[in-house]
């Protein structure tokens, strides 16, 4: 109670402070900061119990996207979609919820993070956890054996998210997958090429793609003396090596998962190694590993993969890392994960720790799980962790204090005198019909200064100004907002001139 009283007092004081600053005509920035503080204090105060029980907020692990954030998001999506299309992918969509049965048994330990929906007329439903399992269901259901597709959509995980690190309960995934029987490692290499192209285009900093193979992992566990039943759980321990030390991983394997210390030590000798194709060669010579059929297949495929990656010019971005053991149960072959080496923080700043920004692998058995006859469709794919990328791009833009345009308006139709609303409406309509992105202020007689100010704030590059004299002369004054230079343009040439100045094609094809 005393706590609430203190907070109420602070809200009152802060309210007075804001009013005082406004009266003193303090700087806009200072007022903005103090208003933000007031809102934060009010948010902590919450609703007065007597007045209102309901707290207005988005559910845990979700967020709204502001126009600024949407502008960032659309730019990121544009880069990704252009790349997917460049590689010949078709696009599909699937329902946001699936039959619970569809998702069961596909995610191993992560199944507990699936959102189940309340009964809707007898069907047990769950929100999709990723886009891969619905894709496999789509292939099996439609009896497709061959497709290259991308899918960008929201997925849902009942996680405890660290939202500052770009982790949410509702988030976008951008998936690209190739399904079909092809010669080994060619589609896999293309997936890695796509991953590198996208991460390079986004300019979010230097990255490295770690590559491994599920068969090498399984073979390695077998020769080290891990029982089949413990493969998956030991995998999840090994996968933590990018975050914690070998000692901690070993303690977990021995202490919590009941592995013999000498078995753990044998695993440690392998999983702490990483390198390039030379490490593949080295392991092919390993007397124990090379005797394991699974591991030998995996190493052979990785050797081939590195040849193709060299031809694609991305071998310098790839590291063969034996500790990579991605958690999902459905991977059967090559697996990969892209991590940022350092985000482009300003000098003297710590790099942002956002972990993995893309991942994927081969899952040849997943479609077969849905086929009554168990017919397999080999698949390989990748997923771009866009939420983490949005976080990095947003923080980078914030650090650079870069202004982002949230609209694409090319021109504002303005008037220099009163009583010209009808003329403005006619002109803006002409521009819209010609495919020009145009706006006008919703006032009968707006001041010219206000109209110009609006353009500056919204980043609109051009103003088409109508005046009495211009109407008589059949011209429109076209003003550049940044250079303030004005030219008279004949009304019939206006559309062409705006398109020329904004670099838009002259016909809407």
């Amino acid at each position: 109670m005393a706590e609430r009283a203190a907070l109420e007092e602070l809200v009152k004081l802060q309210g007075e402070r804001v009013r005082g600053l406004k009266q003193q005509k303090a700087s806009a920035e200072l007022i903005e900061e103090e208003v933000a503080k007031l809102l934060k204090l009010k948010a902590q105060l919450g609703p007065d119990e007597s007045k209102q029980k309901f707290v207005l907020k988005t559910p845990k692990g979700t967020r709204d996207y502001s126009p600024r954030q949407m502008a960032v998001r659309e730019k990121v999506f544009d880069v990704i979609i252009r790349c997917f299309k460049r590689h010949g992918a078709e696009v599909i969509d699937t329902p946001v919820f699936e039959l619970k049965e569809t998702l069961m048994g596909k995610y191993g330990e992560d199944s507990k993070l699936i959102y189940d929906l309340k009964d809707q007329g007898g069907e047990l439903l769950s929100l999709r956890y990723d886009l891969t399992v619905p894709f496999a269901r789509y292939l099996a259901m439609n009896k497709l054996t061959n497709i290259k597709r991308y899918h960008i959509a929201k997925v849902y995980r009942r996680d405890n998210p660290a939202m500052t690190r770009g982790r949410y309960r509702e988030f976008y995934q951008c998936d690209f997958d190739i399904a079909g029987n092809f010669d080994p490692m060619i589609p896999d290499a293309e997936c890695l090429k796509i991953m590198c192209e996208i991460l390079s285009s986004l300019q979010i900093g230097d990255f490295l793609v770690k590559v491994n193979d599920r068969r090498i992992l399984d073979g390695m566990f077998a020769i080290c003396g891990v029982s089949d039943s413990k493969f998956r759980t030991i995998c999840s321990s090994v996968d933590k090596l990018d975050k914690v030390s070998w000692e901690e991983v070993k303690n977990e394997m021995v202490g919590e998962k009941g592995l013999a210390p000498e078995v753990a030590d044998r695993i440690g000798d392998y999983v702490q190694q990483h390198g390039g194709v030379s490490l593949v060669e080295q392991l092919l010579q390993d007397p124990k590993l090379s005797q394991n059929k699974q591991a030998l297949e995996g190493l052979g495929d990785l050797k081939l993969l590195f040849e193709y990656l060299t031809l694609f010019g991305i071998d310098d971005k790839i590291s063969f890392d034996l500790s990579l053991a991605r958690g999902l149960d459905y991977y059967t072959g090559v697996i990969y994960e892209a991590v940022l080496l350092q985000t482009p923080a300003q000098a003297g700043e710590e790099p942002l720790g956002v972990g993995s920004v893309a991942a994927g692998g081969r899952y040849d058995g997943l479609v077969g799980m849905f086929d009554p006859k168990g017919r397999k469709v080999p698949c390989v794919g990748l997923s771009i962790g866009v939420e983490r990328i949005f976080s990095i791009v947003e923080q980078r833009l914030e650090a650079l204090e870069e202004k982002i345009r949230t609209t694409e308006t090319q021109v504002l139709v303005a008037s220099a005198q009163k009583k010209l609303l009808e003329e403005r409406l006619k002109l803006v309509s002409e521009l819209w019909d010609a495919g020009i992105k145009a706006e006008l202020l919703y006032k009968k007689n707006p001041k010219l200064l206000n109209q110009l100010q609006y353009c500056e704030e919204a980043g609109i590059p051009l103003v088409a100004i109508i005046g009495e004299q211009e109407l008589k002369d059949g011209v429109i004054k076209l003003r550049s907002v940044t250079s303030r230079e004005e030219v008279d343009v004949r009304r019939e040439d206006l559309v062409e001139e705006i398109k020329r100045r904004t670099g838009q094609p002259l016909c809407i094809c």
Epitope: L13, Q14, E16, K37, K40, L41, E398
Partner: antibody
Framework: QVQLVESGGGLVKPGGSLRLSCAAS????????MTWIRQAPGKGLEWVSY????????DYADSVKGRFTISRDNAKNSLYLQMNSLRDEDTAVYFC?????????????WGQGTLVTVSS | DIQMTQSPSSVSASVGDRVTITCRAS??????LAWYQQKPGRAPKLLIF???SLQSGVPSRFSGSGSGTHFTLTISSLQPEDFATYYC?????????FGQGTKLEIK
């Protein structure tokens, strides 16, 4: 429980640079304004700089403006103070502190402090 | 900048005594005032904020009052652990400034 631990202090020559860090735990770091406050040996307290939770706002005491830079990494729950062109009068124990109720410029939790000595 | 002046600069008292420390601001700061206690070699500890609100976990023998330019910190019955230096601080406008401190010593 809330904990703030400073590090990075030490002996530095006039004109030199130093970077202080403050590791925070036990609260949602990104919600809080954070501040650096210093205390010269045997003297009183001086508010050096602050930074808002979302990095949007910062300010500096006139005595350090242009030489010190405050920053934070919410992903790492860390606050930093980059100190350049250090002077003798910058010798002090530097404390990082958290604003009470996220935004009120009063330190409700403080670190143990890290000593910066500027001397030739 | 707002100047904060504390008085007295030091005070001697005995366990059980009532002690009052005063803080004046060079201009009106409404109730934007905090009081801290600092022991040698330690970080300051927040006692009072918003002039009179007791920070959680602080004993009720500490109390604050005042608004505008004149503020007081009162310790109703001194305990052995209360001997320390006390600072006031204004939180009205940046740069936020502290008083020069009042050292409370054992008589």
């Amino acid at each position: 429980q809330v904990q703030l631990v400073e590090s990075g202090g030490g002996l530095v020559k006039p004109g030199g640079s130093l970077r202080l860090s403050c590791a925070a735990s036990g609260f949602t770091f990104s919600d809080y304004y954070m501040t650096w406050i210093r205390q010269a040996p045997g003297k009183g307290l001086e508010w050096v700089s602050y930074i808002s939770g979302s990095f949007a706002y910062t300010d500096y005491a006139d005595s350090v403006k242009g030489r010190f830079t405050i920053s934070r990494d919410n992903a790492k729950n860390s606050l930093y103070l980059q100190m350049n062109s250090l002077r003798d009068e910058d010798t002090a124990v530097y404390f990082c502190a958290r604003y009470v109720y996220q935004v009120v410029a009063i330190g409700d939790y403080w670190g143990q402090g890290t000593l910066v000595t500027v001397s030739s | 900048d707002i100047q904060m002046t504390q008085s007295p600069s030091s005070v001697s008292a005995s366990v059980g005594d009532r002690v009052t420390i005063t803080c004046r601001a060079s201009q009106g700061i409404s109730s934007w005032l905090a009081w801290y206690q600092q022991k040698p070699g330690r970080a300051p500890k927040l006692l009072i904020f918003a002039a009179s609100s007791l920070q959680s976990g602080v004993p009720s023998r500490f109390s604050g009052s005042g608004s505008g330019t004149h503020f007081t910190l009162t310790i109703s019955s001194l305990q052995p652990e209360d001997f320390a230096t006390y600072y006031c601080q204004q939180a009205k406008s940046f740069p936020y400034t502290f008083g020069q401190g009042t050292k409370l010593e054992i008589k």
